[in-house]
């Protein structure tokens, strides 16, 4: 599980996998979190040791048992990796260190007026990893207000020295604050040249890109597919850099895929984990454990829960199965990537979700959210199924949310169409985050058919569900993807990680929000919910969510949008935002249409002529 405690005056003995210099224990912990093998760390502040070479030393450690003996060392700080800690996992580090010079390769010097300006320059420079700034009181006049942009082979300082009137810090590119912008394109049949900084095996170019994004010196990559002509190079992901920051040349090459690090993306970074499961693929590596489980999703969950597990293979070979359970091979390697990838097997493979930062936070404390009501801004690609239902009469305005459940299907609330049943007036925007980004040129979907539940009555809370068939199917992208639906009559699953999203009012008498808001809300039992609504019947076709103290809730404009819950590493559409007594009121949970109760209806309405369901359902 997630262990956040720090141990003062303690040093873990043994287990070393890497060492580096970091300015404080928190940065050391972050490096441990992102290191594939690190479970524990020990940090030596300048005050804790006389040996100049070991000052600011950050020692990353691994242990088969998950722990190591602690020895007393005055001033030392030790702790755990934040793997499995959900929202606490972040490569973003904003702190500025006064009286400290972080050494590295100085590749750019300029005069600036403040340390913040220096940090901004570093963030906006593709090669800058960290910086030092000499203040106006620095002892050598010619160096005052100098901003030195730096990098190093490992992304951390090559040394850290105590030096008066110098301030240092890190690039804020991992905070998605770079002004550079990024190249999302993946280039098929193209190989990039330049310097290889690392070589790993990956099942596809997307995993390769994520690894590149979180590698300190990778600016772009080339991936050799599993049909590449040289067998020994198949599935090789080459992480690359160059002096200029861009490839100096590219060569057309069959069965190669190239692309760029997404570290310079302005709005959001990809999660530092790989959630996709690869059927018919085996991942080779060092065996950690073998266990019998029911289904590949449980295998992935087992790997995620076993903190040292990096990736897994779920075997469907008859000799590896008994009854409904099959062997789940939990594996690891030195670099966190498989040592061998085999295709055409009877296995399914994937990665641990231990670094997913939208993971289930029930295991450890989370960074608190502050506004939907009481929510926070969402980031790009976080809720790719969320759509905005807008009406264009004289002006155009957002009225409701909805959820993409298939290429041509959106699920929403029936009450969104009260008084507006004409399909021509509606415009559906998908793959967006900011409503202000919508212009007359922004593509939108039109409605082919509105299917309102036959038992829904205007101004009543019952059967508040509707399907929208789009005129043309949508392509799936990282920002526009369907949400899986629950299984019919899903009553046994206990959901503990549920979120509501929308552009709705941020207070009861508020206004539509520009940035898509998200709020983490606990489910409330129907029995408890019923007690809070003295005059309305809470049926088994409804689900309630809210905090006892109120303060966080869906509101006007969120209607029709999703209540999604993450279970076994998969997001599911549990509810459709429907109604409530006001917004975020104390003891008045929001009421949502329970999607599981309408699965027969959804399946019936979305059946195509060839009898295949046209929406996303969990495997």
């Amino acid at each position: 599980g997630c262990l956040t405690q720090l141990y003062e005056n303690a040093f873990f003995r043994g287990g070393d996998v890497a060492s580096m210099y970091t300015p404080n224990a928190q940065y050391c912990q972050m490096r441990c979190t992102f290191h594939p093998r690190c479970l524990l760390f020990s940090f030596l502040p300048a005050s804790s040791i006389n040996d100049m070479e070991k000052r600011f030393g950050c020692f990353l450690k691994d242990s088969v048992t998950g722990t190591l003996p602690k020895v007393h060392r005055t001033g030392a700080v030790s702790g755990h990796s934040l793997k499995q800690c959900g929202h606490q996992i972040s490569a973003c580090h904003r702190d500025i260190y006064k009286g400290v010079d972080m050494r590295g390769v100085n590749f750019n010097v300029s005069k600036v007026s403040s340390v913040e300006e220096c940090q901004k320059r570093c963030t906006s420079n593709i090669r800058c990893q960290f910086f030092s700034y000499a203040t106006q009181t620095f002892h050598k006049a010619e160096y005052r207000n100098n901003c030195l942009l730096k990098y190093s082979p490992g992304g951390t300082p090559t040394a850290i020295k105590v030096l008066s009137n110098v301030e240092s810090g890190f690039s804020l590119k991992p905070c998605a604050l770079s002004e550079i912008g990024c190249h999302m394109n993946i280039f098929q049949h193209l190989a990039f040249s330049d310097v290889d900084v690392a070589r790993v095996l990956t099942p596809d170019a997307f995993v390769c890109r994520t690894i590149c994004t979180y590698h300190p010196n990778c600016l772009f990559f080339t991936f050799y597919t599993n049909v590449w002509k040289i067998e020994s190079q198949r599935n090789v992901c080459l992480l690359k850099t160059s002096e200029s920051g861009t490839p100096s040349s590219s060569t057309p090459q069959e069965n190669t895929i190239s692309g760029y690090s997404l570290l310079t993306c302005k709005r959001t970074l990809p999660e530092p984990c790989h959630s996709k499961i690869y059927p018919g693929v085996d991942f080779g590596g060092e065996e950690l454990n073998v266990t019998f489980v029911k289904g590949v999703n449980v295998c992935q969950e087992t790997c995620t829960k076993m903190i040292r597990c990096q990736f897994f293979t779920y075997s469907l070979l008859p000799e590896d199965c008994k009854e409904e359970k099959c062997k789940c091979f939990l594996r690891l390697s030195m670099d966190g990537s498989p040592t061998r990838i085999a295709y055409g097997t009877q296995g399914s493979s994937g990665y641990s979700l231990r670094l997913c930062n939208t993971g289930d936070n029930s295991v450890c404390t989370t960074k608190t959210s502050t506004r939907i009501v009481g929510g926070t801004n969402s980031s790009w690609g976080e809720w790719p199924w969320q759509v905005s239902l807008q009406v264009k009469l004289t002006a155009q305005r957002h009225l409701c949310g909805g959820s993409l459940i298939g290429h041509q299907w959106v699920l929403t609330a029936a009450h969104c169409f009260d008084g507006l049943p004409l399909q021509d007036v509606w415009r559906i925007y998908s793959g967006i985050l900011n409503l202000s980004d919508i212009t007359k040129d922004t593509p939108f979907s039109q409605i082919k058919e509105i299917i309102i539940h036959q038992n829904y009555k205007v101004s009543e809370g019952n059967h508040d569900i509707a399907l929208i068939k789009l005129q043309a199917p949508l392509n799936y992208t990282e920002f526009q993807k369907p949400i899986c639906l629950p299984s019919k009559g899903d009553t046994s699953t206990i959901y503990t990680n549920c979120w509501v999203t929308g552009w709705g009012f941020s207070k009861e008498k508020g206004e539509i929000q520009n940035i898509l808001q998200k709020v983490n809300i606990p489910l409330v039992t129907n029995e408890e919910c019923q007690k809070r609504y003295q005059d309305y019947k809470i049926t088994q076709r409804m689900v309630c969510a809210g905090y006892k103290e109120g303060g966080k809730d869906a509101c006007k404009g969120d209607s029709g949008g999703p209540l999604v819950c993450k279970h076994n590493g998969m997001w599911r559409l549990v509810g459709i935002t429907s109604w409530g007594e006001g917004c975020a009121r104390r003891e008045q949970p929001g009421v949502y249409t329970k999607v599981a109760e309408y699965m027969d209806w959804i399946l019936e309405k979305t059946q195509s002529s060839d009898g295949k369901a046209q929406m996303q359902s969990p495997a």
Epitope: K457, E460, G461, N462, Q530, K531, R532, Y533, Q534, D535, Y536, K537, I538, T539, E587
Partner: antibody, heavy 116, light 106 residues
Framework: EVQLQQSGAELVKPGASVRLSCTAS????????IFWVKQRPKQGLEWIGR????????KYDPKIQGKATLTADTSSNTAYLQLSSLTSEDSAIYYC?????????WGQGTLVSVSA | DIQMTQSPSSLSASVGDRVTITCEAS??????IAWYQQKPGKAPKLLIY???TLQSGVPSRFSGSGSGTEFTLTISNLQPEDFATYYC????????FGQGTKVEIK
């Protein structure tokens, strides 16, 4: 306007049964619960039970299980309370009420007198 | 079974008085208590639910408070139309009424 119209007063003999009705207007009984409450002369209120007319699910006060039977007819938007094996203890006003978590709107009540 | 003990059973007060009625539950009822007003020959009327939430249309002189097992209904400025019988109701576990408090003119 939400209204619950209860049937008229009943004078019944001990040991007999009686069926009281509660007809709703201004709302559909399927969308709510119908509760029944008893009030003996000059005494307090006692909850009898609750029916969900949509699926005929019922809940009763354990103390009076068997005495009362709740039913509903959604086509006529009417709920019923059947009382059996009547004794003088059952002489009371019987109220129907609609609501969710509790009784929000009440009918005018039906007086049942049990007398030989 | 949860028992509700209401007190006093009756009280005399004058217009303008502040009147307090209490209800004690035999177990913690998680604030799930409601208060009803009943006038002779009429059906009860919901005043307050969830300890302190005023039902719409009910004058603000009525207020509820309490937690755990002890709850109070307060009428801050008694009006002529407030002379009636008041009942508490727990709805945490099924439904149980208190015995009632008759508020009479002094």
């Amino acid at each position: 306007e939400v209204q619950l119209q209860q049937s008229g007063a009943e004078l019944v003999k001990p040991g007999a049964s009686v069926r009281l009705s509660c007809t709703a207007s201004g709302f559909n009984i399927k969308d709510t619960y119908i509760f029944w409450v008893k009030q003996r002369p000059k005494q307090g209120l006692e909850w009898i039970g609750r029916i969900d007319p949509e699926n005929d699910n019922t809940k009763y006060d354990p103390k009076i299980q068997g005495k009362a039977t709740l039913t509903a007819d959604t086509s006529s938007n009417t709920a019923y309370l059947q009382l059996s094996s009547l004794t003088s203890e059952d002489s009371a006003i019987y109220y129907c009420a609609k609501g969710g978590g509790l009784f929000a709107y009440w009918g005018q009540g039906t007086l049942v007198s049990v007398s030989a | 079974d949860i028992q509700m003990t209401q007190s006093p059973s009756s009280l005399s007060a004058s217009v303008g008085d502040r009147v307090t009625i209490t209800c004690e539950a035999s177990h913690d009822i998680n604030n799930y208590i409601a208060w009803y007003q009943q006038k002779p020959g009429k059906a009860p009327k919901l005043l307050i639910y969830y300890t302190s939430t005023l039902q719409s249309g009910v004058p603000s002189r009525f207020s509820g408070s309490g937690s755990g097992t002890e709850f109070t209904l307060t009428i801050s400025n008694l009006q002529p139309e407030d002379f009636a019988t008041y009942y508490c109701l727990q709805y945490d576990n099924l439904f149980t009424f208190g015995q009632g408090t008759k508020v009479e003119i002094k």
